[in-house]
């Protein structure tokens, strides 16, 4: 069971300082952006991180949403990352959900965050370059210290 708590507005970056944003096709991509670019591209660069209390505490349970014309929420259904047109629900009556991730700081690096899927244990949000794109994907952690699954989260409130 997950119950919604408060939400915050955040900019999410990978460890190469690329900014996560939502493309016109509602796809999450990372790109090099100046602070000015980041502001100019809002709200596509501003993510709503909603925190949830968890009946089985496993880290800070969160959803990640964005509000452009409508609110869309990040999902890892079938291990494919996409934004689905939905509000983060007030309650989720299950111990797993495709939209719930456990946000944890990286041991020894309090400013670096990881997001583990509640649906797929051991799978994390990651940034990987595929052809010309820096994509947000779901990735099985295959090595300790994998920088691709680490992010910085800058509060914009």
């Amino acid at each position: 069971y997950f119950g919604k708590l408060e939400s915050k507005l955040s900019v999410i970056r990978n460890l190469n300082d690329q900014v996560l944003f939502i493309d016109q096709g509602n796809r999450p991509l990372f790109e090099d952006m100046t602070d000015s670019d980041c502001r100019d591209n809002a709200p596509r660069t501003i993510f709503i991180i909603s925190m949830y209390k968890d009946s089985q505490p496993r880290g800070m349970a969160v959803t990640i949403s964005v509000k452009c014309e409508k609110i869309s929420t990040l999902s890892c259904e079938n291990k494919i990352i996409s934004f689905k047109e939905m509000n983060p629900p007030d309650n989720i009556k299950d111990t797993k959900s495709d939209i719930i991730f456990f946000q944890r700081s990286v041991p020894g690096h309090d400013n670096k965050m990881q997001f583990e899927s509640s649906s797929y244990e051991g799978y994390f949000l990651a940034c990987e370059k595929e052809r010309d794109l820096f994509k947000l994907i779901l990735k099985k952690e295959d090595e300790l210290g994998d920088r691709s699954i680490m992010f910085t989260v800058q509060n914009e409130d």
Epitope: R27, K79, E130, R131, D132, L133, I137
Partner: antibody
Framework: QLQLQESGPGLVKPSETLSLTCTVS??????????WGWIRQPPGKGLEWIGS???????YYNPSLKSRVTISVDTPKNQFSLKLNSVTAADTAVYYC????????????WGQGTLATVSS | EIVLTQSPGTLSLSPGERATLSCRAS???????LNWYQQKPGQAPRLLIY???SRATGIPDRFSGSGSGTDFTLTISSLEPEDFVVYYC?????????FGQGTKLEIN
């Protein structure tokens, strides 16, 4: 609704260059999240990926065809093109153009295909 | 370059039966970038399954995909007469795409 249409000569002589163009309608070719690909199918055989191009011009080719293939894009015309040089009878095939969605690298929209025959 | 091998080459079954088509990769397919297509005679292929599991828009739920790593399966739970055509798997890895050689589903 997105539509792709292949065009080009149906007959090419051996050792010459096969040239095809794909015209995209119902959507813009200059999207960040899509690539544009060519796939061929010899008569009675399976599908073979030839290559894909991004709207900014970067190309990715089948290693077995790379030395003979050039794919280019004309964003203002919403078209992309295939050139295959030094053709032989083995290049006779139905040639398809398709959109490749980067979410799962899947060909989700296809043209109806055009038969290119290599013969003297 | 990853090579995909589909088996069997031809599968003979009757309408209403369950079909299991296999696609095996020469190396592990990253991030489940394994897709399935159906091709009817004289037509372009049509996307059925993407990302190993997800049904494309408008595809009936009798089609399902499974697998990971090097072994993937397309299952058709109860065959309809129009399902007796050719099926291809396709993968993406290291910027390169490739297709399997196809499985022909024929009426027994």
């Amino acid at each position: 609704q997105l539509q792709l249409q292949e065009s080009g000569p149906g007959l090419v002589k051996p050792s010459e260059t096969l040239s095809l163009t794909c015209t995209v309608s119902g959507g813009s070719i200059d999207s960040r999240i899509y690539y544009w690909g060519w796939i061929r199918q010899p008569p009675g055989k399976g599908l073979e990926w030839i290559g894909s191009i991004y709207y900014r011009g970067s190309t990715y080719y089948n290693p077995s065809l790379k030395s003979r293939v050039t794919i280019s894009v004309d964003t203002p015309k919403n078209q992309f093109s295939l050139k295959l040089n030094s053709v032989t009878a083995a290049d006779t095939a139905v040639y398809y153009c398709a959109r490749e969605d980067s979410s799962a690298w899947v060909f989700d929209y296809w043209g109806q295909g055009t038969l290119a025959t290599v013969s003297s | 370059e990853i090579v995909l091998t589909q088996s069997p080459g031809t599968l003979s079954l009757s309408p209403g039966e369950r079909a299991t088509l296999s696609c095996r990769a020469s190396q592990s397919v990253r991030n489940n970038y394994l897709n399935w297509y159906q091709q009817k005679p004289g037509q372009a292929p049509r996307l059925l399954i993407y990302g190993a599991f997800s049904r494309a828009t408008g595809i009936p739920d009798r089609f399902s995909g499974s697998g990971s790593g090097t072994d993937f399966t397309l299952t058709i739970s109860s065959l309809e007469p129009e399902d007796f055509v050719v099926y291809y798997c396709q993968q993406y890895g290291n910027s390169i795409d490739s297709f399997g050689q196809g499985t022909k589903l024929e009426i027994n």
